[in-house]
Interface confidence: low
């Protein structure tokens, strides 16, 4: 009979670009923990094996750090990291215990385009200043026809550039594991989420490179 329970950090939120620690704790069982898997949807992030120690998926190696303890630290968060994370404790003789954590990665307030967060006063002041400066420049420029044409051309270029960026920066965050372009994947969509390469969805393994960090510390409380 499985008597153990997994306590997790539950639903947590963090800011884009920041870090977060995912923590699970198995208690109320004397079962021996043989391995802990950390998964994001069906993507394996890391393994902490009693014999081998830590394995980190190389496609996440730049953004995932083992620990503290059996936890996992996610760094350089992107909105694509929003979603469910699971800690899976393989134990003997009990079997498998699974804990769930929901992570929401919030846009940093200045970068937020939607109306979900209020722009702080400094941001508002800066935006106003930019608008005023732009208006003054445009008015001055309009008095000179040649320069006006040049400015018009530059604005057109800027519009085209920003349209191209928006193509790869959807305002709605992609769910974790949604990055399925294996070819010609733009860095903004795949590079940030998968590390160096954008692997196909069913390729769960993504090579686990062994980190010589010593054995995992498997402790359970019987209380």
């Amino acid at each position: 009979m499985m008597t153990g329970t997994i306590e997790t950090t539950g639903n947590i939120s963090a800011e884009k670009g920041g870090s977060i620690i995912l923590q699970c704790h198995l208690s109320s069982t004397t079962a021996q923990v043989t391995q802990v898997n950390w998964e994001q949807q069906d993507q394996l992030l890391a393994i902490c094996n009693a014999d081998l120690g830590w394995h980190i998926s190389p496609s996440f190696k730049d953004r995932v750090a083992p620990g503290p303890g059996l936890g996992l630290t996610l760094q350089s968060l992107t909105v694509n990291d929003t979603g469910e994370y699971f800690c899976i404790y393989h134990t003997y003789p009990d079997g498998t215990y699974t804990g769930r954590i929901f992570l929401e990665v919030l846009e940093s307030s200045v970068a937020e385009h939607g109306a979900r967060f209020q722009i702080p006063l400094l941001g508002a002041m800066a935006a106003t200043l930019v608008v005023i400066c732009t208006a003054v420049i445009v008015v001055v420029a309009l008095t000179r026809k040649k320069k006006a044409l040049r400015i018009h051309s530059v604005e057109g270029d800027l519009r085209r550039k920003s349209a191209g960026q928006e193509e790869w920066s959807p305002s709605a965050p992609s769910p974790p594991g949604s990055c399925v372009q294996a070819e010609a994947a733009p860095a903004g969509l795949c590079g940030e989420q998968r590390g160096e390469d954008c692997a196909e969805l069913h390729d769960y393994f993504n090579v686990l490179s062994y980190r010589s960090l010593g054995n995992c510390s498997f402790f359970t409380e019987t209380g």
């Epitope: 043989t34 391995q35 898997n37 069906d42 394996l44 393994i47 094996n49 014999d51 081998l52 394995h55 190389p58 496609s59 190696k61 899976i88 393989h90 003997y92 079997g95 498998t96 294996a182 070819e183 590390g195 160096e196 390469d197 954008c198 692997a199 196909e200 069913h202 390729d203 769960y204 393994f205 993504n206 090579v207 686990l208 490179s209």
Partner: antibody, heavy 115, light 109 residues
Amino acid sequence: QVQLVQSGAEVKKPGASVKVSCKASGYTFTSYNVHWVKQTPGQGLEWIGTIYPGNLATSYNQKFKGKATLTADKSTSTVYMELSSLRSEDTAVYYCARSGTMDYWGQGTTVTVSS
Amino acid sequence: EIVLTQSPGTLSLSPGERATLSCRASSSISSTYLHWYQQKPGASPKLLIYNTQNLASGIPDRFSGSGSGTSYTLTISRLEPEDFAVYYCQQFGGYPLITFGAGTKLELK
């Protein structure tokens, strides 16, 4: 279509080394792992290790650490497995396979170690 | 070490019959990481089923997979002559990270 083409059969003397190649085509080479599997009549299928060509990260079965070395050449979409200090028990068919699900396999390379 | 035990070692059946192949893990594994392969003499193994129950591309639907925890099954609902081969189960996530069962030989009765 996806293909993994392995180098031909090898006959080696004990103590020698052998380097088996696996050339991938038909998919984005840097987006999938390539695994190596040993097959012998006595031991069945044994996983040797795997390499992720995207960043050349490797992972080995402890049993084959020091025996097998995996490398990859992105420019030619080829993965290599070198077996060192060959012994008679290394005589086997060696396969490369793509991804964790091993959805595509090479045709196999027979390595015979004999004095 | 996670050991996969396949049974029976040899299964003798006739075309048209139903085949049930078992794969038991020495400790619980995630169903996401249990796959089945078919191998014919002189050929490479071929992926049949991945993630316990998903049919690989081009595999006929007479093949099906099921299971969870430590017990997994491959079923061939109605045997065709080309189905006689050796079948292997494989797991990922244990130690070693990938292990195979010893195989079940499906032979003509």
